[in-house]
Interface confidence: low
């Protein structure tokens, strides 16, 4: 059976439809209606109950960057809230609170950077205490043709319910006072997002008059954030007229929640930011709008912006890495909830702990660097996704290693050099997050030196030879010795050992061919020889 509009108005727990913001991937969002109680004669406290934010599913294609109207009829969004009675004007009979919202559910999700959460879809209103301790709301949420309703209970402040002395018996019927009739009246604000106006309906009152006009004709096309004071309301069944004040809320499509967490700090911080879109602060008094952000399970992480709406960032720092936080972000209008988002945010992977490397027993040109497998500490550090191992003598070389290795053989080293090895673990979260580098160092063993460079021979006299050379490119050891061997006809003649490469060989035979062999000795190893042939002259004397 298709419900008629009147059926819908009598329903107390209908799902509400609001204009939809751009579809986004599914996100943990929940919104509860605010409760705004409106009292007559300026003592109003209004309790709004906008409902649950829509969680859009990942397969949806994005909408254009504009507010997409609700499919729920007339491109409108209706809120429902009730005002509480003034303490001087109790409503006759009182009222009972509707059932609470059964088990609010949140859908796990994460927040892509700079993503707007659509403020959308009030679901069903619930009891909510406004600022006044005397506040009690009988909140009903109705699904009228245009969507959800924000019902404002608008008590009057003129006159108490009519009573007679106990001893008096009256047979005639007296009219109910309008203060009593309208003191507990429900006002449905219907938001027409197409033209950003509200319609206010006085619920369950037939032929309500606002002044001399039908309220139905007067209380529409209300501008958001406007207030209408001292509206004289009555109908045929009550007297005298009473007054009510209406405080029209801003459209919830004007608010969107964005993730503003810097990637670099996403492991220990959550940043959320309410932004407004097309909210005219000339007409909407920012003093009436404020917000609160609170993330559990932290106790003292709360941002509050009271009595002003500044679309600034609220960043909670010093949080635990890789931890699920439930963040409640609320927009308050006149001190009570207009929009509530409940979002599950997981902080990014923490900085991993780097194990201490051991540089092992080095050879001349390689060594094995090893380290223990990391022990994961869920409180802070995350298991590494990999390692970066760097080694340097003068210049540095680095190697990226997978997380399943615990050793690496460093090769192509230079003999007899001091090396420093640094190892750091990293995780790939929203950014690569590096742990603190741990170091070890080693000294490679000596190896054979290179040949000497630039060996030259010359004949200063007829029977003497000068031999000079430069040092090897790499000495590969601790000491510096130059060794000269002189040979002639394949036979050993003489040998010199000096710390510099400047040899003077004299008293040689005249007119004889000699072979000069120079090698370098580094105190551990001797290198290959460089050979030069030279002949002495005949004796000129």
């Amino acid at each position: 059976q298709t419900p008629t509009p009147s059926d819908e108005l009598s329903t107390t727990e209908n799902a509400l439809l609001l204009p939809q913001s751009d579809p986004l991937p599914a996100r943990t969002t929940e919104s509860t209606p605010p409760s705004i109680s409106e009292r007559g004669n300026g003592s109003s406290e209004t309790t709004y109950h906008p409902g649950v934010l829509s969680t859009l599913l990942p397969h949806l294609s994005p909408q254009p960057d504009s507010q997409t109207p609700s499919a729920g009829g007339a491109d409108t969004q209706t809120f429902s809230s009730q005002a509480d009675n003034p303490t001087l004007t109790p409503a006759p009979g009182g009222g009972t609170d509707p059932p609470g919202v059964p088990g609010e559910r949140t859908v796990p999700g994460t927040i892509p950077a700079d993503t707007a959460f659509p403020v959308d879809t009030p679901s069903l209103a619930r009891n909510s205490s406004a600022a006044s301790p005397t506040h009690t709301s009988n909140v009903s949420t109705t699904d009228i043709s245009s969507g959800a309703s924000l019902t404002t209970l608008t008590p009057s402040t003129l006159g108490l319910a009519s009573t007679d002395p106990p001893s008096t018996t009256i047979a005639t019927t007296t009219k109910q006072t309008c203060a009593a009739m309208f003191g507990n009246i429900t006002v449905n604000y219907t938001y027409e997002s197409s033209n950003q106006t509200f319609k206010a309906d006085l619920k369950d009152v037939q032929n309500a008059k606002c002044g001399n006009e039908d309220c139905e004709n007067v209380l529409n096309n209300l501008e958001e954030c406007s207030q209408i004071k001292n509206i004289s309301v009555s109908n045929d069944s009550c007297a005298p007229a009473t007054t009510i004040d209406l405080y029209v809320p801003p459209g919830t499509d004007k608010f969107s929640l964005h993730d503003c967490t810097p990637k670099e700090k996403a492991n220990t911080s959550i940043c959320l930011e309410w932004k407004t879109k097309n909210l005219d602060f000339r007409k909407c008094n920012s003093d009436n709008i404020s917000y609160v952000l609170h993330c559990e399970p932290e106790n003292n992480t709360k941002c509050i912006r009271r009595n002003t709406f500044i679309p600034e960032r609220c960043q909670l720092d010093n949080l635990r890495a890789q931890t699920n936080y439930t963040c409640v972000a609320e927009i308050l209008y006149r001190g009570v909830k207009l929009v509530k988002n409940v979002i599950n945010v997981q902080t990014d992977l923490g900085i991993p702990e780097t194990p201490k490397p051991s540089c092992g027993d080095p050879a001349a040109r390689k060594t094995l660097v090893s380290w223990p497998e990391p022990v994961s500490k869920p409180e802070s550090a995350s298991k590494p996704h990999g390692y970066v191992l760097c080694y340097k003598n003068n210049s540095e070389k680095c190697k990226s290693l997978p997380n399943n290795v615990t050793s690496f053989e460093v090769e192509s080293l230079k003999p007899y050099k001091y090396y420093e090895v640094s190892l750091l673990a990293y995780v790939n979260g929203k950014i690569q997050r590096n742990g603190t580098a741990e170091k070890c160092n080693f000294h490679t063993k000596a190896d054979r030196p290179d040949k000497v460079n630039g060996m030259k021979t010359s004949r200063p006299t007829d029977n003497s030879i000068n031999v000079t050379c430069g040092p090897p490119y790499e000495t590969n050891g601790p000491k510096t010795f130059y060794i000269l061997v002189v040979r002639s006809g394949g036979s050993f003649v003489t040998k010199y050992n000096k710390t510099n490469c400047q040899f003077y060989v004299d008293n040689l035979y005249y007119s004889t061919d000699y072979e000069f062999l120079v090698s370098f000795h580094n105190g551990v190893y001797e290198g290959d020889s460089v050979i030069r042939n030279e002949s002495t002259n005949f004796n000129a004397k």
């Epitope: 509009p5 799902a15 439809l17 934010l53 499919a71 009829g73 879809t121 679901s123 043709s145 969507g147």
Partner: nanobody
């Protein structure tokens, strides 16, 4: 999951008529609101008509010319478009929205149907 399959659409002369249909499958949807949106080239998607709990509403531009109806038994909505104008040329999308008391809502969209009035 809800799947929406659209049909209808095509090329029609000004003043002519077309009927679009959108069949939802995968789940009963009597609690959902369904509607039609359209998007002309270079424009943003706009609501054309919607129907929820038996109550229909229309964008001003199509009032009196378009009629939205819904077959609850077959999970189908229809958009009867009469007196079509060139301004009605757009891709028409079927929309399905359910709002849940548990705290979130779901939107689903059809694949889109081209309507050209020329």
């Amino acid at each position: 999951q809800v799947q929406l399959v659209q049909s209808g659409g095509g090329l029609v002369q000004p003043g002519g008529s077309l009927r679009l249909s959108c069949a939802a499958s995968g789940r009963a949807f009597n609690s959902a609101a369904m509607g039609w949106y359209r998007q002309a080239p270079g424009s943003q998607r706009e609501l054309v008509a919607s129907i929820s709990a038996g109550t229909a509403s229309y964008a001003d531009a199509v009032k009196g010319r378009f009629t939205i109806s819904r077959d609850y038994a077959k999970n189908i909505i229809y958009l009867q478009m009469n007196s079509l104008k060139p301004d009605d040329t757009a891709v028409y999308f079927c929309n399905y929205r359910t709002t849940y008391t548990s705290g979130y809502s779901e939107d689903y969209w059809g694949q889109g149907t081209q309507v050209t009035v020329s």
